[in-house]
């Protein structure tokens, strides 16, 4: 039995990366720990070194292969273990049977760009990164726009219920600086969660033409 409260959470990016976080109350800060991945039906296994992210939390990325290679399928089950060094031996601190396509978190969308901007609207596009071809078009997106004087948390969420890698923002204020972010989630997976937000895209609406009602 492991002393204290332990939590071991991992997500698959749908291609060649499993990211894990392990938190353990009362764990020793100077102990060397790693995550070991052992698929049930593959010839390879993989290890990554857990690095501290807070007082009682460690994280690491299992790199399974080339970023766009399909290293696991929906039938695979991966045994994930947290192993910590105790003298000359490794002790199992946490273990889970991990179904990769039930625990998905995709990479943040990339390549955000302004396609067209006017006084009151702006058309923005983006791309998804390292997402499996398994999903076909069955992805959804959330987007948010940061207005002057507001925080990201206050920004209303816009939901796109299909694989649509663009958005037309309406009812914007002329000659105003905005920022825009988007995130993605597959429909597949009981424990699937949203990707991180993309890097913000800054844009400015065009000024209203003088003497004209726009």
């Amino acid at each position: 039995a492991v002393n204290g409260t332990s939590q071991f959470t991992c997500f698959y990016n749908s291609r060649a990366n499993i990211s894990c976080v392990w938190s353990q109350d009362g764990a020793l800060q100077d102990t060397s720990c790693q995550v070991h991945a052992w698929p049930d039906r593959r010839r390879w296994n993989q290890t990554c070194e857990l690095l501290p992210v807070s007082q009682a939390s460690w994280a690491c990325n299992l790199i399974l292969g080339a970023p766009d290679s399909q290293k696991l399928t929906t039938v695979d089950i991966v045994t994930l273990r947290v192993l910590c060094r105790e003298g000359v031996r490794w002790r199992v601190m946490a273990i889970q049977d991990f179904k990769p396509f039930e625990n998905l978190r995709l990479m943040a969308p990339i390549s955000l760009q302004v396609v067209h901007v006017e006084t009151h609207r702006c058309n923005i596009s983006w791309e998804i990164s390292q997402a499996s071809h398994y999903f076909e078009r069955h992805l959804e997106f959330e987007a948010r726009t940061l207005s002057p004087g507001h925080t990201w948390e206050e920004a209303p969420l816009l939901t796109l219920k299909q694989k649509q890698e663009w958005i037309c923002l309406e009812t914007l204020t002329p000659d105003t600086q905005y920022e825009f972010q988007v995130r993605v989630k597959p429909l597949q997976g009981e424990f699937t969660t949203w990707s991180p937000w993309s890097q913000p895209l800054a844009f400015r609406t065009k000024p209203a033409a003088l003497g004209k009602d726009t």
């Epitope: 399909q70 399928t73 929906t74 396509f101 071809h133 999903f135 076909e136 429909l187 009981e190």
Partner: antibody, heavy 117, light 107 residues
Framework: EVQLVQSGAEVKKPGATVKISCKVS????????MHWVQQAPGKGLEWMGW????????EYAPGFQDRVTITADTSTDTAYMELSSLRSEDTAVYYC??????????WGQGTTVTVSS | EIVMTQSPATLSVSPGERATLSCRAS??????LHWYQQKPGQAPRLLII???QSISGIPARFSGSGSGTEFTLTISSLQSEDFAVYFC?????????FGQGTKLEIK
């Protein structure tokens, strides 16, 4: 327009092998999963397996894995299903289909295979 | 192997009325449940994925619900073209398995 066109009906003797083709158009075959499903009169729909055309990996259902081989020719955008050691209970309609691993978005028209001595 | 049981085997409903088809899984499958329609002499057609998500191009009268082991396909107002066989399919445990089908016929 997505299309999956299967080869014609076959009549085979018990113990023989049948190979059905599925020619696709209207989508990128090289990043698709191609599936095969059996629909036998008394047994309903049974998933036989799939091939990932991106990397050639296959997955077979346990009930078929000893006798079925699924292949894909990316130069002609054609998937194949070969079923060996045929018996009378293999008399069925066989469908190819395209989809992610979890469900089947587009289907071929079906190929009837009759196994009879 | 997960066994999918559909009920009833045959359902007789008048055009314009509502039809409710049931599908039960032999173990918990979360929302990994999909519905198909098959007309005589044709291949099945995908209607609903993950229990409740409609496929684009499918009429809004088709809706799905349920999670865990009990699922329902509802057709709110039956049209003549809706009379067909309906199959459910699970994708929680390989091999994926289908129900035996519910035949929806004109009353």
């Amino acid at each position: 327009e997505v299309q999956l066109v299967q080869s014609g009906a076959e009549v085979k003797k018990p113990g023989a092998t049948v190979k059905i083709s599925c020619k696709v158009s209207g989508f990128n075959f090289k990043d698709s999963l191609m599936h095969w499903v059996q629909q036998a009169p008394g047994k309903g729909l049974e998933w036989m397996g799939w091939i990932d055309s991106e990397n050639g990996e296959t997955e077979y259902a346990p009930g078929f894995q000893d006798r079925v081989t699924i292949t894909a020719d990316t130069s002609t955008d054609t998937a194949y299903m070969e079923l060996s050691s045929l018996r009378s209970e293999d008399t069925a309609v066989y469908y190819c289909a395209r989809g992610g691993p979890w469900f089947l978005s587009y289907w071929g028209q079906g190929t009837t295979v009759t196994v009879s001595s | 192997e997960i066994v999918m049981t559909q009920s009833p085997a045959t359902l007789s409903v008048s055009p314009g009325e509502r039809a409710t088809l049931s599908c039960r899984a032999s173990q918990i499958i979360s929302n990994n449940l999909h519905w198909y329609q098959q007309k005589p002499g044709q291949a099945p057609r995908l209607l609903i994925i993950y229990g409740l998500q409609s496929i684009s191009g499918i009429p809004a009268r088709f809706s799905g619900s349920g999670s865990g082991t009990e699922f329902t396909l509802t057709i709110s107002s039956l049209q003549s073209e809706d009379f067909a066989v309906y199959f459910c399919q699970q994708s929680n445990n390989w091999p994926w398995t289908f129900g035996q089908g519910t035949k929806l016929e004109i009353k």
